[in-house]
């Protein structure tokens, strides 16, 4: 049911009116406008864009649009002392240097303030030593190196290829292995799709292209100097030595032309298997050090970047709700980019802009949503989700009491094959129902629904006849809302065909070549995929803000809780003897999941039967739905990760981008066979089962009849 009757508005102002107002041509125009110059966080250009967006959102008709500023730790290369890597001979002479910048794309040769490739928050340093190739620098890659191949990375400079996991996890793993420096590079195996030309003739990464990015391990802390609290004008800041998540060794990214020069000389051990080989014409030897003729040569890093407390600006727009103004549905995406941001973030920001315009048009015609909608243009996402996290820290008391849902809106596309959705199980039915009503933009699916093309192209691995919906991990601005505050969250974008394209992300990610032309020429010339993403994101916001009963289905949480309990039990049962020895039982967890299932079904029955014309009962039922996600929050957080407080989901400890279910139990079980004190280790498993079981049971009870 639409909420038209609740807000006494004309029937034409329904979801259809909102969706019909969204126009591909406008998204295209906005994307062009947002991508002509760089908008690096902390720069004047990005402040000016914030003010422009504030002004336009006001024109579009929002009730208020404010800038929220914070002073956070950012990182920049030294303009007069560039970062690079060299090969040095036995006399210390530099016989090869990596490039200092990416060759600019055609038409952008005269653009100033293009930040050269760097790893944000790298400490300064000039380490030199032998190179060790560590594949993707994942946990399992270091296990292979250290345990199977007996290769010691201590005191070495490691070179790792980008892909598979968040770069910050790579750096953390290298640090733990004792490395004294990290070189990150993009291998064509991961960033060059076969049969496609490199930019500007196609969407592949040229040899001189480099991926920028932060290398923090913040674990949800936000600004490294003010964890847990907003970086406002009276903030107490930690000293840099106590800052959260900063890397301790120099790190620098390079392209595959430069990587070739380093890797072609590698000696030592051969790669352990074919999964360690990329696509360069090099042996992919692991090292340590260079082969015979070059064995006296070393690698030296020259890193001179600085960390600086810098002002950032979020734009926060408000469209007041007519019936429940104290209930907030938030649509947020970041504005800051590494360079032009053709995809990341401006393909998302342009969609948000058009969604705001459509809502504003309806508002000017006398309509209001039932609940308040907040629109956010976040700053400094690329530096560790800083803008969104600081704002949420500042407003945490309001958000935990009033936050209904958060919809993220970073890059709208990472391909043009099919839809990709990650969200809380509470939103599964919303996403299914919405996509069944939207037209598919895909070739060969004319006249068919988005749900149909999505299900066909990206089927669920567990449930046949359904599309894949993934767990929320992190690496984007929903993190603080979902993982810290327990606000139901979701994200949607168009993606590539993961079956045929095994490369990580999209090839030009975080490079200078991520331009408007990349999108307009190669990804979405008609902007039909952008429009579809606008319809999905906007449609979700519309329903969440306007439906009389919140479009959350607690039964779907019951289904996944059982699946996750089954999965974690199966992992544990790889150690049957220890399970017996230490009396490890999952009975409490399975019992809690069963109780949740029963109570959720009874709640759903009541939800269908209650008197929706009684505002008190309606509010009561909606509050139970709103607060269900909140009930999965453990105020004490996960072990050593106090800002990851969701007991059912957390970013993987081995890959920030990926979501892990029952993360407390999972981490306690991880590599448990190698723990020095098995009794203590299995004791922690038991404790985590207890925490999970209690949390699921407590969440179930929030759905019980209130009296």
């Amino acid at each position: 049911k639409s909420s038209n009757e609740a807000t006494n508005i004309t029937p034409k102002h329904n979801m259809k009116a909102f969706l019909d107002e969204l126009k591909a041509e406008n998204i295209k125009k906005f994307l062009y406008n947002f991508t002509q110059i760089p908008h690096l966080a902390g720069t004047e250009q990005n402040f000016q864009l914030a003010k422009q967006i504030q002004s336009q959102w006001k024109e579009f008709g929002l009730d208020s649009v404010e800038l929220a500023h914070y002073d956070v730790l950012l990182s920049y290369p030294n303009k007069t002392h560039p970062n690079y890597i060299s090969i040095i001979n036995e006399d210390g002479n530099e016989i090869f240097n990596t490039s200092l910048f990416e060759p600019p794309p055609p038409g952008y040769e005269n653009v100033s303030d293009i930040v050269p490739p760097f790893s944000a928050f790298s400490p300064q340093g000039m380490p030199e030593g032998d190179l060790v190739y560590v594949n993707y620098a994942r946990t399992e890659d270091f296990f292979k190196l250290e345990r199977d191949m007996k290769i010691n990375c201590s005191g070495k400079i490691v070179i790792a290829r980008y892909g598979k996991v968040f770069r910050g996890n790579k750096v953390k793993n290298a640090q733990l292995a004792g490395a004294k420096g990290v070189i990150l590079y993009s291998d064509p195996a991961d960033y060059f799709a076969p049969g496609v030309k490199s930019y500007p003739d196609g969407w592949n990464l040229p040899g001189g292209g480099v991926q920028r990015g932060n290398i923090l391990n913040l674990n949800g802390a936000g600004d490294p100097l003010t964890p847990g609290y907003p970086a406002n004008e009276y903030a107490y800041r930690r000293g840099i030595a106590e800052a959260v998540g900063l890397p301790s060794i120099p790190v620098h990214p390079i392209g595959y032309y430069d990587a070739q020069k380093l890797l072609e000389k590698m000696g030592g051990s051969a790669p352990p298997d074919s999964s360690w080989r990329g696509s360069l014409k090099v042996p992919y030897n692991v090292g340590p050090g260079f082969t015979g003729n070059f064995s006296t040569q070393k690698v030296k890093m020259h890193i001179h970047s600085t960390n600086e407390v810098t002002r950032i600006y979020n734009v926060i727009g408000t469209l007041r709700g007519a019936v429940e103004p104290d209930r907030y549905v938030i649509l947020g995406g970041h504005r800051d980019s590494w360079v032009f941001g053709g995809i990341d973030p401006q393909s998302g920001a342009a969609v948000v802009h058009e969604i705001v315009r459509s809502f504003g048009t309806l508002k000017k015609e006398g309509w209001r949503p039932r609940r308040t909608i907040l629109f956010a243009s976040w700053d400094a996402e690329e530096f560790g989700l800083l803008g969104s996290t600081e704002w949420a820290e500042e407003n945490s008391r309001l958000l935990q009491e009033r936050g209904v849902a958060y919809i993220n809106a970073d890059s709208s596309i990472e391909g043009n094959y099919t839809l990709r959705v990650d969200c809380t199980p509470l939103m599964y039915s919303l996403v299914h129902n919405l996509t069944k009503e939207l037209k598919s933009p895909d070739e060969g699916f004319e006249g068919k629904s988005l749900y149909e093309s999505w299900t066909k192209k990206s089927p669920s691995p567990e449930f046949s006849g359904m599309p894949r919906i993934s767990k929320l991990g992190s690496g984007n601005d929903f993190e603080v809302f979902f993982q810290r505050l327990g606000i139901a969250s979701g994200r949607a974008r168009y993606t590539k065909n993961w079956e045929t394209n095994k490369f990580s992300g999209y090839p030009l990610y975080h490079s200078v070549y991520e331009t408007y032309e990349l999108v307009e020429k190669f990804y979405d010339p008609m902007f039909k995929y952008h429009l579809t993403v606008a319809q999905v994101r906007g449609g979700m916001v519309f329903e969440l803000a306007n439906s009389i009963v919140l479009p959350f289905d607690c039964r779907d949480y019951a289904v996944v809780l059982r699946k996750y309990a089954d999965k974690i039990y199966s992992i544990s049962m790889k150690h049957p003897q220890e399970m017996k020895t230490y009396s490890v039982s999952f009975d409490s967890l399975f019992s809690a999941v069963k109780n949740f299932t029963e109570i959720a079904s009874k709640f759903s029955e009541r939800l269908q039967d209650f008197d929706k014309s009684n505002p008190i009962v309606l509010r009561m039922m909606n509050d139970q739905l709103m607060f269900l996600e909140r009930a999965f929050i453990d105020p004490l957080g996960l072990p050593d990760r106090p800002f990851y407080r969701h007991v059912i989901y957390a970013p993987s400890s081995h890959n920030k981008y990926a979501g892990e279910s029952f993360p407390g139990i999972y981490d306690a079980l991880f590599d448990i066979e190698s723990k020095v004190d098995p009794s203590k280790a299995w004791g922690e498993v038991k404790r985590q089962i207890y925490v999970a079981a209690f949390t699921v049971q407590a969440a179930a009870e929030t759905l019980s009849e209130v009296a």
Epitope: Y428, A558, A600, S601, K602, E605
Partner: antibody
């Protein structure tokens, strides 16, 4: 009271298709997982498939995966089993069963009377 | 073939007690709830025991269930001729993501 009534059984040739229906009443259909269980003549019970409450996540026995499709229409209080590429070993009485707990299968507290499917040339 | 193993048949005189075992593994009985079903000749199965040891309303307390480790047991005391039927255990299997039934046991009243 709770009632489950199956229909759609009959004689079909190997390789053929059949669609079974189960009309449910007396409970909030959408909140409960529903299953199909079959029993070959003179044999024991074999669980075939289940569909959850909520969005309707599906589960199948290995013996029918890729051939059978379970679905439901909550607005019509109806459960279906679409059976394709039928084999002689699919001959059985097919029962529709309601879960006793909620959205995923735990136990079956109500059963239909069954409908006979015979696969024979 | 069934994942859960039951004896093919058990028998006893009226008034006596019988027990039926159901043996599984850690992924089914070991960490899930067991239910028992009675199937009288020519009729649909009927729920007898759920959650290892609970009886639905209308089921006499002559029927009892228990679970220990990876095995479950159904007990019938004060056997009556009307108890002649096939009995099946059932549970969820976490590894298979599937519901599994036992092989079935025929109870004969001598």
């Amino acid at each position: 009271e709770v009632q489950l009534v199956e229909s759609g059984g009959g004689l079909v040739q190997p390789g053929g298709s059949l669609r079974l229906s189960c009309a449910a009443s007396g409970f909030t259909f959408s909140s409960y997982a529903m299953s199909w269980v079959r029993q070959a003549p003179g044999k024991g019970l074999e669980w075939v498939s289940a569909i959850s409450g909520g969005i309707g996540s599906t589960y199948y026995a290995d013996s029918v995966k890729g051939r059978f499709t379970i679905s439901r229409d909550n607005s019509k209080n109806t459960l279906w089993l679409q059976m394709n590429s039928l084999r002689a070993e699919d001959t059985a009485v097919y029962y529709c069963a309601k879960d006793g707990v909620g959205a995923t299968p735990y136990y079956f507290d109500y059963w239909g009377q069954g409908t006979l499917v015979t696969v024979s040339s | 073939q069934s994942v859960l193993t039951q004896p093919p048949s058990v028998s006893a005189a009226p008034g006596q007690k019988v027990t039926i075992s159901c043996s599984g593994s850690s992924s089914n009985i070991g960490n899930n709830y067991v239910s028992w079903y009675q199937q009288l000749p020519g009729t649909a199965p009927k729920l007898l025991i759920y959650d290892n040891n609970k009886r639905p309303s209308g089921i006499p307390d002559r029927f009892s269930g228990s679970k220990s480790g990876t095995s479950a047991t159904l007990g019938i005391t004060g056997l009556q001729t009307g108890d002649e039927a096939d009995y099946y255990c059932g549970t969820w299997d976490s590894s298979l993501s599937a519901y599994v039934f036992g092989t079935g046991t025929k109870v004969t009243v001598l």
